[in-house]
């Protein structure tokens, strides 16, 4: 879609962002791409956050310009300077905080025109679960542990053999606050486990969904884990 701006004589350019989630305490990426320009000096990138007075980050004339940067982002943001020329305006965010959640705008000016796109950034904590056989227990028991989650997730057990079965009566889940007083360790125990079966421990909050599988046979134990971020959509 090309829109003419009579006053500036510039057209709109396509800017694309992807909604994403940040894992608190780790680094995050706010993704943004645009129609590239031939000259780096003609490209201006501005990252703004709704409700924040100063800029999140500004890059222009081939370098960072951070005199108007908001204090909450000082020393925590960087663009991939060598990739700006090919249309990458993504922002790296150091040590993601809960307060970094919100609506961001990636605003681009090039010699071809202007454009912007919003990005919803969620923050929380999510980690891969590990399922093990609990040999200390009196009966056959599985223990599912994940070190860091926030907000508090739900934990659901499932099994390949008893598909659709409700394991809430034979499982017990606890949440233990970690030392930084935000994230929590998730521990879920499943009792009365039968051999030659595959069990899944599914942990989910509004940011991520993670599954830890364990296959228990008489001769071996096989484990598998995967994690999926929810609501990653382009705009």
């Amino acid at each position: 879609l090309i829109i003419g701006f009579g006053i500036s004589g510039r057209h709109s350019i396509t800017v694309t962002t992807v909604a994403s989630a940040g894992n608190i305490g780790e680094d995050g990426i706010l993704s943004c791409t645009f129609e590239p320009d031939i000259k780096l000096s003609d490209i201006v990138i501005q990252w703004l956050k709704e409700g924040v007075l100063g800029l999140v980050h500004e890059f222009k004339e081939g370098k960072d310009e951070l005199s108007e940067q908001d204090e909450m982002f000082r020393g925590r943001t960087a663009v991939f300077a060598d990739q700006v020329i090919v249309g990458n305006a993504s922002l790296r965010l150091k040590n993601v905080q809960l307060t970094d959640a919100g609506t961001y705008k990636c605003y681009i000016i090039t010699s071809k025109g202007k454009g912007n796109a919003n990005l919803e950034y969620k923050t929380g904590a999510f980690s891969m679960p590990e399922v093990n056989v609990d040999y200390n227990a009196s009966s056959e028991t599985l223990r599912c542990e994940a070190p860091r989650w926030f907000p508090q997730p739900t934990v659901v057990w499932a099994s390949q053999v008893d598909q659709g079965a409700n394991f809430s009566e034979v499982s017990n889940t606890s949440f233990e606050l970690n030392s930084e007083n935000v994230t929590m360790k998730v521990v879920s125990v499943l009792y009365n486990v039968t051999i030659n079966n595959t069990y899944s421990c599914m942990i989910e909050n509004d940011i991520a969904k993670a599954t830890g599988d364990i296959k228990v046979t008489e001769s071996e134990i096989k484990r598998r884990s995967h994690l999926q971020l929810l609501n990653s959509k382009a705009s």
Partner: antibody, heavy 119, light 107 residues
Amino acid sequence: QIQLQESGPGLVQPSQSLSITCTVSGFSLTSYGVQWVRQSPGKGLEWLGVIWSGGSTDYNAAFISRLSISKDNSKSQVFFKMNSLQADDTAIYYCARDITTIVEGFAHWGQGTLVTVSA
Amino acid sequence: NIVMTQSPKSMSMSVGERVTLSCKASEKVGTYVSWYQQKPEQSPKLLIYGASNRYTGVPDRFTGSGSATDFTLTISSVQAEDLADYHCGQSYSYPFTFGSGTKLEIK
């Protein structure tokens, strides 16, 4: 190329204040923060504070009551002032710049200025 | 404050030997660890940033590795000019802190 150069008094009387100027070239103070680090004789490095592109500062809590950092973007100068110096503040004082706008490593250092606190 | 503990305090190596320096953080610092070389009467020089990225112009015999709390600087084949103090530092959270250094001597 990127350069930082400290200029200081060399000798400071106990209980007096220390002022150091760091003059930079090859980059703009509106793009990068400038860090301050000191090294006492035979000791390790100690981070003192930073002034960011926008002029805001962060200080090591151990020095917050007697340290102030300011700058003049147009002159490419950063000003470091520490009050109430004692003998154990004798050190080489460095200004330094980060490798990127995210603090990942101090890539550029001044030559350092030796400050001796003595009567 | 995050404490960075370096070991050993000092070591003496022959030219051509492999050197491994250790730096342990008292809390997780992600990959926000840098390594510096400081020769007598000189300012520190950045060798490694982001735990494993070699800074421009640094010889490829210097390698950094590690994440979270345990970090290593390896010199694959030490040279006479590597005689220096080596410092690790974290820039994950305030106050930024450094280890007390490892003195590398050449036999």
